[in-house]
């Protein structure tokens, strides 16, 4: 393969130094080998993004409006499979527990804070507000276009996109995936949602010039605002209960 790049993750460094001269790609910031035939985990992508910010690389600087969760960007700890570790800490020894999408689900504490497990986010609600159009999109056409997008671009199994709701100009995409439902090769809804979020913001993680091209019966879908809500298999443990928006 003369073109040794990672089509699914531009935040990688690739070479042909592996066995048999096979192209291998490692995530920036962690040096973890990634599978370029599928999506890279959100944890490794966040880590790469933070390392790129530190090194001053301009192509991955987040936009001023980038809100991943209520605490903003952080440099996460990932396990050997690229998943978020249950406990995350910053440089000042402030720690907190996160869910499987890396969003804080407890109050912040010190290094004595215990996080027994990574609580799975089994329901992601993506809320989009589209730019005004001459007339509302046909709900059925919009539904099939978004299902096609998640299946083709993010390789998310159709059963994990449970519903598309539409009340002009608000679109809601519901992703649901229990731990028991996720097969070995299945894309995680957390990763699909993150890739979609970056695509919507014009910060695609895919290689090449081909960006997001969402259109409903020839009418382009332009998104003005995105909100992402994460619902976990266990309720969050804040002293004041709240829903986590991203």
């Amino acid at each position: 393969q003369s073109n040794c790049t990672c089509p699914t993750n531009k935040m990688t460094v690739c070479d042909t130094n592996g066995p048999g001269g096979v192209c291998q790609c490692r995530a920036m910031g962690s040096q973890v080998l990634v599978d370029c035939s599928t999506l890279t985990s959100k944890c490794l992508l966040l880590k790469a993004r933070m390392s790129a910010r530190k090194s001053g690389r301009s192509l991955v600087m987040p936009s001023e409006h980038a809100i991943l969760d209520n605490d903003g960007l952080y440099d996460p700890e990932c396990d050997d499979k690229g998943r978020f570790k249950a406990r995350q800490c910053n440089q000042t020894s402030v720690c907190w527990c996160v869910n499987s999408v890396g969003v804080r689900r407890t109050d912040k504490g010190d290094q004595s804070l215990r996080c027994d497990e990574v609580v799975r986010t089994h329901h992601i609600l993506i809320e989009l507000r589209h730019r005004p159009t001459d007339r509302a999109f046909n709900h059925s056409d919009l539904d099939s276009e978004l299902r096609r997008l998640f299946q083709e671009r993010y390789k998310l199994h159709p059963s994990f996109l449970s519903a598309v709701h539409y009340e002009e100009p608000t679109i809601q995409i519901e992703l649901r995936q229990n731990a028991s439902q996720k097969g070995l090769r299945d894309v995680d809804i957390a990763d699909a949602a993150y890739y979609f979020e970056r695509d919507i913001k014009g910060e695609s993680l895919f290689m090449g010039r081909r960006g997001l091209d969402v259109q409903v019966r020839g009418e382009p879908l332009h998104v003005e605002r995105t909100l992402i809500y994460y619902l976990d298999e266990k309720p969050p443990q804040f002293s004041m209960k709240r829903l986590t928006a991203g």
């Epitope: 790049t5 089509p7 671009r153 259109q215």
Partner: antibody
Framework: AVTLDESGGGLQTPGGALSLVCKAS????????MFWVRQAPGKGLEWVGV????????NYAPAVKGRATISRDNGQSTMRLQLNNLRAEDTGTYYC???????????????????WGHGTEVIVSS | ALALTQPSSVSANPGETVKITCSGS???YGWFQQKSPGSAPVTVI????KRPSDIPSRFSGSTSGSTGTLTITGVQADDEAVYFC????????FGAGTTLTVL
């Protein structure tokens, strides 16, 4: 049935320009990426270029880059290939083809072609 | 552009199983049958393993790593043709073609 009909081929002079048209029927043209593929006499298939559903994105093979323009008219279900500064090596049969995966990250890949036209022959000679 | 490698020729007796491989890209593979030079190609497999509705079920496709495989189970005389693979991550590429001879 999916039908793709190419037209516009024939004898062309070196340095000139050609315009090929692909007329599609039997499917919702607006929902598919479209390709041009050519085959020189006695040779293999050569990917020429691709255009996405809306026409906002095109990609071309190095051999035609800077000389080729692919456009489409979704209302008429047609795609066009304009090729300028013709050379002898542009001789061959030009096929219009349909891409099955418009959102895939590697959607420019010939691996997604699921239907072909019958082809139109182009001869570049003085 | 990526170079796709496939064997120049394979042969088989009627009823046998034939496998044609194509390597060189991690993208999605397609397989195209051309029965005579200048005749239009026919897609027998696209998107790694999808088969158009008018293609017999004896044609199947699979991928492993950067290699795609076209399998014809119970090859018939009518399957004699040149088979091209197609792929590439960022722009289209075709293999040079494999001539299938049915003995």
């Amino acid at each position: 049935a999916v039908t793709l009909d190419e037209s516009g081929g024939g004898l062309q002079t070196p340095g000139g320009a050609l315009s090929l048209v692909c007329k599609a029927s039997g499917f919702d043209f607006i929902d598919y990426d479209m390709f041009w593929v050519r085959q020189a006499p006695g040779k293999g298939l050569e990917w020429v270029g691709v255009i996405n559903r809306s026409g906002s994105y095109t990609n071309y093979a190095p051999a035609v880059k800077g000389r080729a323009t692919i456009s489409r008219d979704n209302g008429q279900s047609t795609m066009r290939l304009q090729l300028n500064n013709l050379r002898a090596e542009d001789t061959g049969t030009y096929y219009c083809a349909r891409g099955a995966c418009t959102h895939c990250w590697d959607a420019d890949s010939a691996g997604y072609i699921d239907a072909w036209g019958h082809g139109t022959e182009v001869i570049v000679s003085s | 552009a990526l170079a796709l490698t496939q064997p120049s020729s394979v042969s088989a007796n009627p009823g046998e199983t034939v496998k044609i491989t194509c390597s060189g890209s991690s993208g999605s593979y397609g397989w195209f049958q051309q029965k005579s030079p200048g005749s239009a190609p026919v897609t027998v497999i696209y998107w790694n393993d999808k088969r158009p509705s008018d293609i017999p079920s004896r044609f199947s496709g699979s991928t492993s790593g950067s290699t795609g495989t076209l399998t014809i189970t119970g090859v018939q005389a009518d399957d004699e043709a040149v088979y091209f693979c197609g792929n590439a991550d960022s722009s289209g590429t075709f293999g040079a073609g494999t001539t299938l001879t049915v003995l």
